[in-house]
């Protein structure tokens, strides 16, 4: 009796199942009571040997590639082998890489976690990501797994992390880089700081008084409001960062606390109060003003 | 296909400015870095910086901070430089081209534009 | 900025012939992620630049097995092994390792 090895599908795909069928054209395995095994190269595979004529194998992988036959052994032990048949497993290689952000959109806050996704459409076996930073790349992190997708973790993010990203993806075809994705960092506004600017030293009435509130820290735009007494005198808006300044014309009832808020819809912050006095000197005329 | 289209030749008066555009097709144009590269009659190349289509984030050669100002539109994959105050210094073939990341070459380049200043 | 100098100015060659080109960096182009991004592109009259070599010695997809290019710090070369009509030009040189990125000053390859 001649024995035969059917692999089916006999070209798997990696990863995809495969079944192996011993068979027997010319005898019925219910004709007599057989045991069956199955061999890789030189080694036996699953349980070893079993009265089931089928071996189903899960998940098939590139090593898996080989030379595989089985054998049958009646109860009187006469042992019949099949030829050995090749099993190629087919490789697909990594298409479509593409690069996302959680939080979506690469806006993401100073101090928060950012997580860059790295995906591919088509891709079977080990796949080694690489994560790299700016447009001329400098490899932050490589993983390789059996996953179609894998993660980059920066779990506080900083200021300097502000940049362009790509990730690559490879599985034995080649490198395939994902396009660019910017990552914006949000940064709120820090405590802003007052001054008063006087055309001199001794401010007068009627004088133009320059209130200048400055922010160090945050994103743009910000939105200044400036403040006497609690009472808003008006706001500026700075919409690529940095200070922005209100004027006041002096008049007697200047006098008093001044302050001014920063925000940038991240947050508001309030500087500490700068106080003007209005003073007298002796032997003027006319009132002066001093911070 | 992959293709970089810019507009047509220009002639300027000193002073004036001018907006040179480069229309991407065959790819997704949010995924690569456009730069700009500037040719001198029976001159050599200069590399005057990229932006990225992706948020509008230029860079610039520091030389030519001032003078440029590159821009981005996303809704007709379009890449524009606009050049300000002309001299004739400024008169050349401007290129643009798609830099390809992790290989990092100039793989496309637009079929260049000419800008001639002059009163 | 780095310099980047290209000698000869012009290379005349008979078909057939082997050319050499040469770029030096006024300083080492090796970035500091270990890469050197040294490009040559080949400009045709009326042409835009056509890429033929990346990252000091890497050809480009369909640039013939004639092209090679080598070197390494500051000191770079582009061969030709048998030049061709095609081949005739002008070769520049390019350094993307440090910003601003340069161009060498150009080869014209003619013909003898």
């Known amino acids: 009796a001649e024995l035969f090895l059917i692999a089916s599908p006999s070209h798997p795909t990696e990863g995809s199942p495969v079944t192996l069928t011993c068979k027997m054209p010319f005898l019925q395995s219910s004709d007599a009571q057989f045991q069956f095994c199955f061999f890789r190269d030189t080694r036996a595979l699953g349980p070893g040997w079993s009265s089931s004529p089928k071996l189903q194998i899960a998940a098939m992988w590139k090593e898996d590639t080989g030379s595989y036959w089985c054998e049958a052994q009646t109860m009187a032990s006469k042992v019949l082998r099949s030829r050995r048949s090749q099993i190629n497993v087919h490789r697909v290689p990594v298409a479509d890489v593409s690069l996302e952000t959680q939080p979506p959109g690469g806006q993401v806050m100073e101090g928060d976690r950012l997580v860059l996704i790295c995906s591919v459409a088509m891709g079977t076996g080990d796949i080694t990501f690489l994560w790299y930073k700016g447009a001329v790349g400098l490899n932050l992190q490589s993983k390789t797994q059996r996953s179609l997708t894998a993660e980059y973790e920066i779990p506080s993010v900083r200021e300097s992390d502000a940049e362009q990203y790509y990730c690559v993806a490879e599985n034995g075809y080649g490198p395939s880089p994902s396009g660019l994705v910017s990552i914006t960092v949000r940064i709120p506004v820090s405590r802003p700081i007052l001054m008063l600017r006087a055309p001199r030293a001794q401010a007068a009435v009627e004088d133009v008084l320059e209130l200048h509130c400055e922010a160090l820290r945050g994103s743009p735009p910000i939105l200044y409001w400036f403040y006497h007494e609690d009472i808003t005198l008006g706001s500026r808006s700075a919409p690529s960062g940095g200070g922005a300044s209100f004027n006041l014309s002096l008049t007697e009832e200047h006098s008093g606390n001044y302050s001014c808020e920063a925000n940038n819809g991240l947050g508001a912050q309030r500087s500490e109060a700068v106080t003007l006095n209005f003073t007298v000197p002796t032997g003027a005329r006319s009132n002066h003003l001093t911070s | 296909q992959v293709q970089l289209q810019q507009s047509g030749p220009e002639l300027v008066k000193p002073g004036a400015s001018v907006r040179i555009s480069c229309k991407a097709s065959g790819y997704t144009f949010t995924s690569y870095n456009i730069h700009w590269v500037k040719q001198r009659p029976g001159q050599g190349l200069e590399w005057i910086g990229w932006?990225?289509?992706?948020?509008?984030?230029?860079k610039y050669n520091e030389k030519f901070k001032g003078k440029t100002t590159l821009t981005a539109d996303k809704s007709s994959s379009t890449a524009y430089m606009q050049l300000s105050s002309l001299t004739s210094e400024d008169s050349a073939v401007y290129f643009c081209?798609?830099?390809?990341?992790?290989?990092?070459?100039?793989?496309?380049w637009g079929q260049g534009t000419t800008l001639t200043v002059s009163s | 900025d780095v310099l980047m100098t290209q000698t000869p100015l012009s290379l005349p060659v008979s078909l057939g012939d082997q050319a050499s080109i040469s770029c030096r960096s006024s300083?080492?182009?090796?970035?500091?992620?270990?890469?050197?991004?040294l490009e040559w592109y080949l400009q045709k009259p009326g042409q835009s630049p056509k890429l033929l070599i990346y990252?000091?010695?890497n050809r480009f997809s369909g640039v013939p097995d004639r092209f090679s290019g080598s070197g390494s710090g500051t000191d770079f070369t582009l061969k030709i092994s048998r030049v061709e009509a095609d081949d005739l030009g002008v070769y520049y040189c390019f350094q993307g390792s440090h910003v601003p990125w340069t161009f060498g000053g150009g080869t014209k390859l003619e013909i003898k």
């Open positions: 300083q080492s182009i090796v970035h500091s992620n270990g890469n050197t991004y």
């Open positions: 081209a798609r830099r390809i990341h992790y290989y990092d070459y100039f793989d496309y």
């Open positions: 990252k000091v010695s």
């Open positions: 932006i990225y289509p992706g948020d509008g984030n230029p």
